[in-house]
Protein backbone atom coordinates (compact mmCIF):
# COMPACT_ATOMS: atom_id res chain seq x y z
CA UNK A 1 0.00 0.00 0.00
CA UNK A 2 1.68 3.19 -1.04
CA UNK A 3 -0.13 5.79 0.65
CA UNK A 4 1.87 8.81 2.34
CA UNK A 5 0.06 10.15 5.18
CA UNK A 6 0.27 14.00 3.61
CA UNK A 7 -1.11 12.56 0.68
CA UNK A 8 -4.87 13.24 -0.13
CA UNK A 9 -5.85 11.35 -3.67
CA UNK A 10 -9.46 11.62 -5.35
CA UNK A 11 -7.88 9.09 -8.15
CA UNK A 12 -4.94 7.53 -9.50
CA UNK A 13 -4.57 10.22 -12.18
CA UNK A 14 -3.76 12.61 -9.23
CA UNK A 15 -1.43 9.80 -7.73
CA UNK A 16 0.26 9.47 -11.17
CA UNK A 17 0.86 13.15 -11.14
CA UNK A 18 2.14 13.73 -7.52
CA UNK A 19 5.13 11.29 -9.00
CA UNK A 20 4.17 7.75 -7.85
CA UNK A 21 4.44 5.92 -11.47
CA UNK A 22 4.21 2.14 -10.01
CA UNK A 23 1.35 -0.19 -10.46
CA UNK A 24 0.32 -0.91 -7.28
CA UNK A 25 -2.59 -0.52 -4.45
CA UNK A 26 -3.17 3.18 -3.63
CA UNK A 27 -5.43 5.19 -0.86
CA UNK A 28 -8.05 7.37 -2.40
CA UNK A 29 -9.87 10.24 -0.48
CA UNK A 30 -14.00 10.45 -1.31
CA UNK A 31 -14.20 13.75 -3.22
CA UNK A 32 -17.38 14.63 -0.69
CA UNK A 33 -15.85 13.34 2.84
CA UNK A 34 -12.91 12.95 4.60
CA UNK A 35 -13.36 8.62 4.07
CA UNK A 36 -11.20 7.06 2.22
CA UNK A 37 -10.92 3.58 -0.03
CA UNK A 38 -7.76 1.21 -1.15
CA UNK A 39 -7.93 1.40 -4.79
CA UNK A 40 -5.42 -0.58 -7.90
CA UNK A 41 -3.99 2.13 -9.90
CA UNK A 42 -2.82 1.22 -13.27
CA UNK A 43 0.45 3.32 -14.07
CA UNK A 44 1.38 1.53 -17.21
CA UNK A 45 -1.43 0.92 -19.78
CA UNK A 46 -1.83 3.69 -22.20
CA UNK A 47 -0.35 6.66 -20.18
CA UNK A 48 -1.56 5.44 -16.73
CA UNK A 49 -3.27 6.95 -13.75
CA UNK A 50 -6.18 4.42 -14.49
CA UNK A 51 -8.12 3.92 -11.57
CA UNK A 52 -9.69 0.25 -11.63
CA UNK A 53 -13.14 -0.08 -10.46
CA UNK A 54 -13.35 -3.89 -11.07
CA UNK A 55 -11.42 -6.99 -12.04
CA UNK A 56 -11.82 -10.53 -12.74
CA UNK A 57 -9.65 -12.78 -13.52
CA UNK A 58 -9.84 -16.14 -11.73
CA UNK A 59 -13.00 -16.52 -9.75
CA UNK A 60 -11.25 -16.48 -6.62
CA UNK A 61 -14.48 -13.39 -5.13
CA UNK A 62 -18.20 -14.21 -5.05
CA UNK A 63 -19.50 -11.36 -7.30
CA UNK A 64 -23.17 -12.43 -6.19
CA UNK A 65 -23.11 -9.83 -3.73
CA UNK A 66 -25.65 -7.73 -1.81
CA UNK A 67 -26.18 -3.54 -2.52
CA UNK A 68 -24.93 -2.29 0.15
CA UNK A 69 -21.53 -4.56 -0.71
CA UNK A 70 -21.46 -3.30 -4.29
CA UNK A 71 -22.24 0.42 -3.17
CA UNK A 72 -19.28 0.23 -0.57
CA UNK A 73 -16.94 -2.36 -2.54
CA UNK A 74 -15.67 -5.72 -2.09
CA UNK A 75 -12.83 -8.17 -2.99
CA UNK A 76 -9.09 -7.53 -3.06
CA UNK A 77 -7.89 -4.80 -5.17
CA UNK A 78 -4.66 -6.71 -5.80
CA UNK A 79 -6.93 -9.50 -7.40
CA UNK A 80 -10.50 -9.66 -8.21
CA UNK A 81 -12.19 -6.50 -6.69
CA UNK A 82 -15.57 -4.30 -7.15
CA UNK A 83 -14.18 -0.75 -6.04
CA UNK A 84 -17.77 0.46 -4.75
CA UNK A 85 -20.50 2.41 -6.62
CA UNK A 86 -21.26 5.22 -4.04
CA UNK A 87 -16.93 6.26 -4.69
CA UNK A 88 -17.20 5.58 -7.75
CA UNK A 89 -20.34 8.17 -8.66
CA UNK A 90 -18.80 10.86 -6.20
CA UNK A 91 -15.86 10.71 -8.35
CA UNK A 92 -17.60 10.74 -11.80
CA UNK A 93 -19.97 13.67 -10.76
CA UNK A 94 -16.58 16.11 -9.94
CA UNK A 95 -15.06 15.98 -13.46
CA UNK A 96 -15.50 14.19 -16.72
CA UNK A 97 -14.17 10.65 -16.85
CA UNK A 98 -13.49 8.00 -19.26
CA UNK A 99 -14.30 4.10 -18.88
CA UNK A 100 -12.25 1.61 -20.21
CA UNK A 101 -13.31 -1.68 -20.26
CA UNK A 102 -10.72 -4.52 -20.87
CA UNK A 103 -11.28 -7.68 -22.14
CA UNK A 104 -9.76 -10.95 -22.35
CA UNK A 105 -11.65 -14.07 -23.92
CA UNK A 106 -9.89 -18.23 -23.44
CA UNK A 107 -7.87 -18.23 -27.21
CA UNK A 108 -5.86 -15.44 -26.28
CA UNK A 109 -7.63 -12.34 -27.62
CA UNK A 110 -7.84 -9.09 -26.17
CA UNK A 111 -10.46 -6.29 -26.71
CA UNK A 112 -11.58 -2.90 -25.64
CA UNK A 113 -14.18 -0.66 -25.43
CA UNK A 114 -13.69 2.85 -24.31
CA UNK A 115 -16.37 5.22 -23.85
CA UNK A 116 -15.41 8.89 -23.86
CA UNK A 117 -18.00 9.83 -21.29
CA UNK A 118 -19.36 7.95 -18.51
CA UNK A 119 -20.63 9.12 -14.78
CA UNK A 120 -22.93 6.52 -12.53
CA UNK A 121 -26.09 8.53 -10.98
CA UNK A 122 -26.15 8.76 -7.44
CA UNK A 123 -27.90 5.98 -5.09
CA UNK A 124 -31.37 7.38 -5.15
CA UNK A 125 -31.24 7.25 -8.62
CA UNK A 126 -29.81 3.49 -8.23
CA UNK A 127 -26.29 4.00 -9.39
CA UNK A 128 -27.79 4.69 -13.06
CA UNK A 129 -25.12 4.17 -15.72
CA UNK A 130 -24.31 6.81 -18.14
CA UNK A 131 -22.04 6.25 -21.66
CA UNK A 132 -21.00 8.19 -24.50
CA UNK A 133 -18.70 8.31 -27.23
CA UNK A 134 -17.58 4.72 -27.64
CA UNK A 135 -15.03 3.35 -29.37
CA UNK A 136 -12.35 0.25 -29.37
CA UNK A 137 -12.15 -3.63 -30.44
CA UNK A 138 -14.94 -4.91 -28.14
CA UNK A 139 -17.63 -3.78 -30.98
CA UNK A 140 -19.13 -1.37 -32.60
CA UNK A 141 -22.69 -1.27 -30.29
CA UNK A 142 -22.33 -0.97 -26.67
CA UNK A 143 -22.62 -3.92 -24.63
CA UNK A 144 -24.01 -1.62 -21.55
CA UNK A 145 -27.50 -0.79 -22.22
CA UNK A 146 -27.58 2.84 -23.43
CA UNK A 147 -29.24 4.77 -22.19
CA UNK A 148 -28.63 5.14 -18.47
CA UNK A 149 -29.87 1.30 -17.39
CA UNK A 150 -30.21 1.24 -13.37
CA UNK A 151 -27.99 -0.98 -11.18
CA UNK A 152 -29.16 -4.33 -10.01
CA UNK A 153 -28.14 -6.27 -7.11
CA UNK A 154 -30.09 -9.51 -5.85
CA UNK A 155 -31.21 -7.67 -3.15
CA UNK A 156 -32.02 -4.64 -5.10
CA UNK A 157 -33.64 -5.17 -8.35
CA UNK A 158 -33.97 -2.26 -10.55
CA UNK A 159 -34.33 -3.89 -13.80
CA UNK A 160 -36.68 -3.65 -16.73
CA UNK A 161 -37.44 -7.58 -16.68
CA UNK A 162 -39.92 -9.57 -14.81
CA UNK A 163 -37.60 -12.27 -14.59
CA UNK A 164 -35.02 -10.49 -11.66
CA UNK A 165 -32.06 -10.09 -13.68
CA UNK A 166 -29.40 -10.48 -11.43
CA UNK A 167 -30.66 -13.07 -9.37
CA UNK A 168 -31.19 -15.23 -12.47
CA UNK A 169 -27.91 -13.96 -14.35
CA UNK A 170 -25.83 -13.24 -10.73
CA UNK A 171 -23.73 -10.65 -10.01
CA UNK A 172 -24.45 -6.98 -9.53
CA UNK A 173 -24.88 -4.76 -13.07
CA UNK A 174 -26.51 -2.25 -15.05
CA UNK A 175 -28.90 -4.99 -16.02
CA UNK A 176 -32.03 -3.58 -18.21
CA UNK A 177 -33.56 -6.33 -19.50
CA UNK A 178 -31.57 -7.83 -18.80
CA UNK A 179 -29.07 -6.65 -21.38
CA UNK A 180 -26.54 -7.52 -23.68
CA UNK A 181 -23.59 -7.72 -20.92
CA UNK A 182 -22.42 -8.77 -17.08
CA UNK A 183 -19.03 -8.53 -16.44
CA UNK A 184 -20.21 -9.43 -12.84
CA UNK A 185 -21.32 -12.73 -13.83
CA UNK A 186 -20.38 -16.55 -12.64
CA UNK A 187 -16.77 -17.44 -13.50
CA UNK A 188 -16.20 -20.26 -15.26
CA UNK A 189 -13.47 -21.80 -15.81
CA UNK A 190 -11.49 -22.94 -19.59
CA UNK A 191 -13.65 -25.26 -21.43
CA UNK A 192 -16.78 -24.50 -18.84
CA UNK A 193 -17.16 -20.93 -20.77
CA UNK A 194 -19.40 -21.68 -23.39
CA UNK A 195 -23.34 -21.66 -23.39
CA UNK A 196 -23.18 -20.30 -20.51
CA UNK A 197 -26.25 -17.32 -19.58
CA UNK A 198 -25.14 -16.35 -16.55
CA UNK A 199 -21.24 -16.06 -17.12
CA UNK A 200 -19.37 -13.09 -17.66
CA UNK A 201 -20.37 -11.71 -21.12
CA UNK A 202 -20.05 -8.88 -23.49
CA UNK A 203 -22.30 -9.88 -26.12
CA UNK A 204 -21.34 -7.69 -28.77
CA UNK A 205 -17.56 -8.91 -28.57
CA UNK A 206 -18.47 -12.72 -27.87
CA UNK A 207 -21.87 -13.22 -28.10
CA UNK A 208 -24.49 -14.25 -25.62
CA UNK A 209 -23.11 -17.77 -24.46
CA UNK A 210 -19.29 -16.74 -23.86
CA UNK A 211 -17.92 -16.13 -20.45
CA UNK A 212 -14.67 -14.10 -20.63
CA UNK A 213 -11.58 -15.05 -19.03
CA UNK A 214 -10.63 -11.85 -17.67
CA UNK A 215 -12.11 -8.31 -17.15
CA UNK A 216 -10.87 -4.84 -16.11
CA UNK A 217 -12.97 -1.79 -15.48
CA UNK A 218 -10.55 1.50 -15.82
CA UNK A 219 -11.41 5.20 -15.14
CA UNK A 220 -9.65 8.31 -15.46
CA UNK A 221 -10.45 12.27 -16.14
CA UNK A 222 -10.75 12.88 -19.64
CA UNK A 223 -8.40 15.68 -19.44
CA UNK A 224 -5.39 13.77 -18.11
CA UNK B 1 -44.33 11.65 -16.71
CA UNK B 2 -41.85 14.66 -16.83
CA UNK B 3 -43.44 17.78 -18.73
CA UNK B 4 -41.63 20.91 -19.82
CA UNK B 5 -42.98 24.38 -20.18
CA UNK B 6 -41.83 27.52 -21.56
CA UNK B 7 -42.83 31.18 -21.19
CA UNK B 8 -41.61 34.30 -21.63
CA UNK B 9 -42.68 37.46 -23.98
CA UNK B 10 -43.49 36.46 -28.15
CA UNK B 11 -42.19 40.22 -29.32
CA UNK B 12 -38.57 41.62 -28.23
CA UNK B 13 -36.73 44.88 -29.69
CA UNK B 14 -33.69 44.63 -31.34
CA UNK B 15 -30.37 44.89 -29.40
CA UNK B 16 -32.60 44.17 -25.68
CA UNK B 17 -32.24 40.90 -24.08
CA UNK B 18 -34.79 38.35 -24.33
CA UNK B 19 -35.76 36.36 -21.52
CA UNK B 20 -37.35 32.91 -21.42
CA UNK B 21 -38.50 30.39 -18.80
CA UNK B 22 -38.68 27.00 -18.35
CA UNK B 23 -40.88 25.52 -16.13
CA UNK B 24 -40.30 21.35 -15.71
CA UNK B 25 -43.02 19.08 -13.74
CA UNK B 26 -42.21 15.81 -13.00
CA UNK B 27 -38.65 15.15 -12.38
CA UNK B 28 -36.14 17.47 -10.31
CA UNK B 29 -33.93 19.17 -12.46
CA UNK B 30 -31.01 19.04 -9.56
CA UNK B 31 -31.55 14.76 -9.47
CA UNK B 32 -30.24 14.12 -13.03
CA UNK B 33 -29.77 15.02 -16.90
CA UNK B 34 -29.21 18.36 -18.98
CA UNK B 35 -31.73 20.94 -19.43
CA UNK B 36 -31.35 22.00 -22.87
CA UNK B 37 -32.42 25.17 -24.73
CA UNK B 38 -33.10 25.12 -28.68
CA UNK B 39 -34.24 27.29 -31.43
CA UNK B 40 -35.59 26.76 -34.66
CA UNK B 41 -35.70 29.04 -37.14
CA UNK B 42 -38.30 29.78 -40.10
CA UNK B 43 -37.59 27.39 -42.64
CA UNK B 44 -37.49 24.76 -39.79
CA UNK B 45 -33.34 24.85 -39.01
CA UNK B 46 -32.63 23.72 -35.79
CA UNK B 47 -29.98 25.13 -33.73
CA UNK B 48 -28.88 23.94 -29.88
CA UNK B 49 -27.89 27.07 -27.76
CA UNK B 50 -26.92 25.20 -24.34
CA UNK B 51 -27.57 23.85 -21.34
CA UNK B 52 -27.35 23.53 -17.60
CA UNK B 53 -26.65 20.35 -15.83
CA UNK B 54 -28.36 18.73 -12.92
CA UNK B 55 -24.95 19.85 -11.16
CA UNK B 56 -25.63 23.64 -12.27
CA UNK B 57 -22.31 23.40 -15.20
CA UNK B 58 -23.36 25.24 -18.11
CA UNK B 59 -22.10 24.57 -22.05
CA UNK B 60 -23.31 27.01 -24.52
CA UNK B 61 -22.85 26.83 -28.38
CA UNK B 62 -19.57 28.73 -29.53
CA UNK B 63 -21.29 30.55 -32.11
CA UNK B 64 -23.92 32.18 -29.02
CA UNK B 65 -20.71 32.19 -26.23
CA UNK B 66 -20.66 36.04 -26.00
CA UNK B 67 -24.46 36.74 -25.70
CA UNK B 68 -25.92 33.59 -23.98
CA UNK B 69 -26.74 32.59 -20.51
CA UNK B 70 -28.22 29.61 -19.03
CA UNK B 71 -29.23 29.79 -14.78
CA UNK B 72 -32.20 28.13 -12.87
CA UNK B 73 -34.03 28.24 -9.64
CA UNK B 74 -34.35 24.67 -8.08
CA UNK B 75 -36.49 25.94 -5.83
CA UNK B 76 -38.96 26.68 -8.37
CA UNK B 77 -37.89 23.95 -10.85
CA UNK B 78 -37.19 26.41 -13.27
CA UNK B 79 -34.37 26.84 -15.34
CA UNK B 80 -34.16 30.21 -17.84
CA UNK B 81 -32.38 31.63 -20.70
CA UNK B 82 -30.93 35.26 -21.46
CA UNK B 83 -29.73 35.89 -25.04
CA UNK B 84 -28.25 39.92 -25.06
CA UNK B 85 -27.88 42.10 -28.41
CA UNK B 86 -30.96 40.48 -29.91
CA UNK B 87 -31.25 40.78 -33.94
CA UNK B 88 -34.08 40.23 -35.98
CA UNK B 89 -32.02 37.13 -37.11
CA UNK B 90 -33.05 35.53 -33.39
CA UNK B 91 -36.69 35.33 -34.11
CA UNK B 92 -37.23 31.85 -33.82
CA UNK B 93 -39.76 29.27 -31.62
CA UNK B 94 -37.48 28.49 -28.45
CA UNK B 95 -37.66 25.17 -27.04
CA UNK B 96 -36.47 23.50 -23.88
CA UNK B 97 -35.50 20.08 -23.71
CA UNK B 98 -34.06 17.17 -21.34
CA UNK B 99 -31.64 15.00 -23.09
CA UNK B 100 -30.50 11.88 -21.85
CA UNK B 101 -26.94 12.72 -20.04
CA UNK B 102 -26.06 14.93 -17.46
CA UNK B 103 -22.09 16.21 -17.97
CA UNK B 104 -22.27 16.27 -22.08
CA UNK B 105 -24.36 17.02 -24.80
CA UNK B 106 -27.13 14.02 -25.55
CA UNK B 107 -30.37 13.23 -27.64
CA UNK B 108 -33.31 14.82 -25.74
CA UNK B 109 -36.08 12.69 -24.66
CA UNK B 110 -38.37 15.26 -23.32
CA UNK B 111 -38.97 18.83 -24.99
CA UNK B 112 -41.83 21.57 -24.42
CA UNK B 113 -44.23 22.75 -26.78
CA UNK B 114 -42.16 25.64 -27.74
CA UNK B 115 -42.70 29.83 -27.63
CA UNK B 116 -42.35 31.91 -30.59
CA UNK B 117 -40.61 35.05 -30.22
CA UNK B 118 -40.19 37.86 -32.72
CA UNK B 119 -37.31 40.38 -32.73
CA UNK B 120 -38.40 43.50 -34.50
CA UNK B 121 -38.76 47.26 -33.31
CA UNK C 1 -18.92 21.85 -35.57
CA UNK C 2 -19.65 18.74 -37.40
CA UNK C 3 -21.94 19.26 -40.12
CA UNK C 4 -24.87 16.70 -41.23
CA UNK C 5 -25.70 16.45 -44.17
CA UNK C 6 -29.35 15.17 -44.46
CA UNK C 7 -31.07 13.70 -47.66
CA UNK C 8 -33.05 13.85 -49.59
CA UNK C 9 -35.04 17.27 -48.70
CA UNK C 10 -38.60 16.07 -49.79
CA UNK C 11 -39.85 12.77 -49.85
CA UNK C 12 -43.36 12.05 -52.09
CA UNK C 13 -44.44 8.73 -51.14
CA UNK C 14 -47.39 6.21 -50.93
CA UNK C 15 -48.23 5.20 -47.73
CA UNK C 16 -47.62 1.49 -47.30
CA UNK C 17 -43.85 2.29 -48.92
CA UNK C 18 -40.49 1.93 -47.44
CA UNK C 19 -38.67 4.98 -47.10
CA UNK C 20 -34.92 5.82 -46.00
CA UNK C 21 -33.42 9.04 -45.12
CA UNK C 22 -29.63 9.51 -44.88
CA UNK C 23 -27.56 11.68 -42.28
CA UNK C 24 -23.28 12.08 -43.45
CA UNK C 25 -21.20 13.37 -40.79
CA UNK C 26 -19.03 15.85 -41.51
CA UNK C 27 -16.02 13.76 -39.29
CA UNK C 28 -17.08 10.25 -37.25
CA UNK C 29 -19.73 10.90 -34.97
CA UNK C 30 -19.29 7.30 -33.17
CA UNK C 31 -22.79 5.73 -33.00
CA UNK C 32 -24.13 9.20 -31.28
CA UNK C 33 -26.85 10.02 -33.64
CA UNK C 34 -30.20 10.54 -32.89
CA UNK C 35 -33.57 10.84 -34.94
CA UNK C 36 -36.25 13.06 -34.29
CA UNK C 37 -39.93 13.23 -35.78
CA UNK C 38 -41.59 16.96 -35.73
CA UNK C 39 -44.80 16.61 -36.75
CA UNK C 40 -46.89 20.07 -37.56
CA UNK C 41 -47.37 22.13 -35.02
CA UNK C 42 -45.41 19.78 -32.48
CA UNK C 43 -42.47 20.05 -31.27
CA UNK C 44 -39.04 17.15 -32.19
CA UNK C 45 -40.31 14.21 -30.83
CA UNK C 46 -37.32 11.46 -30.06
CA UNK C 47 -37.78 8.14 -32.15
CA UNK C 48 -33.92 6.90 -32.24
CA UNK C 49 -31.22 7.24 -30.53
CA UNK C 50 -27.39 5.92 -30.22
CA UNK C 51 -28.25 5.42 -33.95
CA UNK C 52 -30.10 2.02 -33.91
CA UNK C 53 -32.10 1.99 -30.35
CA UNK C 54 -35.71 2.33 -30.67
CA UNK C 55 -36.70 5.14 -27.80
CA UNK C 56 -39.88 4.01 -25.72
CA UNK C 57 -42.97 3.51 -27.34
CA UNK C 58 -41.64 4.00 -30.80
CA UNK C 59 -43.18 1.50 -33.50
CA UNK C 60 -41.14 -0.92 -34.63
CA UNK C 61 -41.49 0.15 -38.20
CA UNK C 62 -39.01 2.81 -37.20
CA UNK C 63 -35.37 2.03 -37.43
CA UNK C 64 -32.01 3.40 -37.73
CA UNK C 65 -28.35 2.09 -38.65
CA UNK C 66 -25.17 3.52 -38.75
CA UNK C 67 -21.38 4.11 -37.12
CA UNK C 68 -18.96 6.58 -37.59
CA UNK C 69 -19.73 9.23 -40.84
CA UNK C 70 -23.00 6.99 -42.56
CA UNK C 71 -26.27 7.14 -40.79
CA UNK C 72 -29.32 6.26 -41.94
CA UNK C 73 -33.32 6.20 -40.80
CA UNK C 74 -35.69 4.11 -42.70
CA UNK C 75 -39.37 3.60 -42.17
CA UNK C 76 -40.70 0.33 -43.35
CA UNK C 77 -44.14 0.66 -44.33
CA UNK C 78 -45.33 4.51 -44.19
CA UNK C 79 -48.38 5.10 -42.75
CA UNK C 80 -50.22 8.50 -43.51
CA UNK C 81 -49.44 9.69 -39.45
CA UNK C 82 -45.93 9.42 -40.72
CA UNK C 83 -46.02 12.97 -42.00
CA UNK C 84 -43.80 15.05 -40.85
CA UNK C 85 -40.28 16.58 -40.95
CA UNK C 86 -37.58 14.21 -39.85
CA UNK C 87 -33.99 15.63 -38.46
CA UNK C 88 -30.56 13.34 -37.51
CA UNK C 89 -28.86 14.82 -34.90
CA UNK C 90 -25.01 14.32 -33.65
CA UNK C 91 -23.91 14.68 -30.43
CA UNK C 92 -20.75 13.08 -30.49
CA UNK C 93 -19.11 16.21 -30.04
CA UNK C 94 -20.01 19.86 -28.76
CA UNK C 95 -21.75 21.44 -30.17
CA UNK C 96 -24.62 18.88 -30.87
CA UNK C 97 -25.48 19.56 -34.50
CA UNK C 98 -28.93 18.63 -36.52
CA UNK C 99 -29.03 18.01 -40.35
CA UNK C 100 -31.01 20.31 -42.27
CA UNK C 101 -34.08 18.04 -41.73
CA UNK C 102 -36.33 15.99 -44.89
CA UNK C 103 -40.05 16.42 -45.43
CA UNK C 104 -41.98 13.42 -45.72
CA UNK C 105 -45.27 13.84 -47.69
CA UNK C 106 -47.54 11.90 -48.55
CA UNK C 107 -49.02 11.18 -51.91
Known amino acids: DYKDDDDKFRDCAEVFKSGHTTNGIYTLTFPNSTEEIKAYCDMEAGGGGWTIIQRREDGSVDFQRTWKEYKVGFGNPSGEYWLGNEFVSQLTNQQRYVLKIHLKDWEGNEAYSLYEHFYLSSEELNYRIHLKGLTGTAGKISSISQPGADFSTKDGDNDKCICKCSQMLTGGWWFDACGPSNLNGMYYPQRQNTNKFNGIKWYYWKGSGYSLKATTMMIRPADF | DVQLQESGPGLVKPSQSLSLTCTVT?????????WNWIRQFPGNKLEWMGY???????SYNPSLKSRISITRDTSKNQFFLQLNSVTPEDTATYYCARSTFGHYVSSMDYWGQGTSVTVSS | SIVMTQTPKLLLVSAGDRVTITCKASQSASNDVAWYQQKPGQSPKLLIY???NRYTGVPDRFTGSGYGTDFTFAISTVQAEDLAIYFC?????????FGGGTKLEIK
Open chain 2, 26 to 34: GYSITSDYA
Open chain 3, 50 to 52: YAS
Open chain 2, 52 to 58: ISYSGST
Open chain 3, 89 to 97: QQDYSSPPT
